[in-house]
Amino acid sequence: AVNGTSQFTCFYNSRANISCVWSQDGALQDTSCQVHAWPDRRRWNQTCELLPVSQASWACNLILGAPDSQKLTTVDIVTLRVLCREGVRWRVMAIQDFKPFENLRLMAPISLQVVHVETHRCNISWEISQASHYFERHLEFEARTLSPGHTWEEAPLLTLKQKQEWICLETLTPDTQYEFQVRVKPLQGEFTTWSPWSQPLAFRTKPAALGKDT
């Protein structure tokens, strides 16, 4: 699509995965395309097949190694190419010089659990997954709580401006069902974005004791 708009967006999970999305106006759904990754200072290269995710959008994951292995550093540059089959040949559609630590999106936090719950408050903890040791403590979190009768979009965002893998939710209503989600973002990187939201953790506050409010 010479005059159409295309977009090639990739993110590094900080360990061993680069996830890419390629979209192009007017492209055929059954077009066969791939992403090729060529690092400037590594012996390996990697390819993934772009699979359709919507009408004119394809996605794939470049698996660089074992999930917790540190495959790239801040000095690496990976040349990413989108190649699509046209008849008998592969045609280069897009090229990006990819700086992994400028384009970070971590995995969603995992292992959410209720540490302690009362009538009006709940303490919740979580863990980060496949996050590079390079970050040390340079991470931030956002959390949100789903109250009855509301949507996730309506939930106010709670910001934790440091690497704090727990939160104490307060001013909750007794004997009420809630859901909780958290996401993480490194402070590093011009194009870095928030991780996906964690799987929701459902919890229920304790009922108020008869005759008194705890």
Partner: nanobody, 123 residues
Amino acid sequence: EVQLVESGGGLVQAGGSLTLSCAASGRAFSNYPVGWFRQAPGKEREFVAAITWLSGSTLYADSVEGRFTISRDNAKNTVYLLMSSLKPEDTALYFCAAALKTITRGQNDYSYWGQGTQVTVSS
């Protein structure tokens, strides 16, 4: 904001050569990949070639592959288009353009544009 200024256009005989320059200034220009496009009278603007800054990876239109060479000089913040074996159908206004991250053949993928330099190839 990124500013792009093309130069090097002119009149040349068929079979001859010409080198166009695209000088850039502005915010962190060395992060932006650059493409060349051209527009002949009465025709749509078309992709010619593009290059990434860091790896120097290149992309060419089929019509110029093997005849044109795109290159860059990072120290001078300049991209060049060496045009050889020129044909009358290469006559056009040549534009350079900067993309944010990715080079493609689509003009809508480029965010910053120069004013153009005229190339005329006589038979």
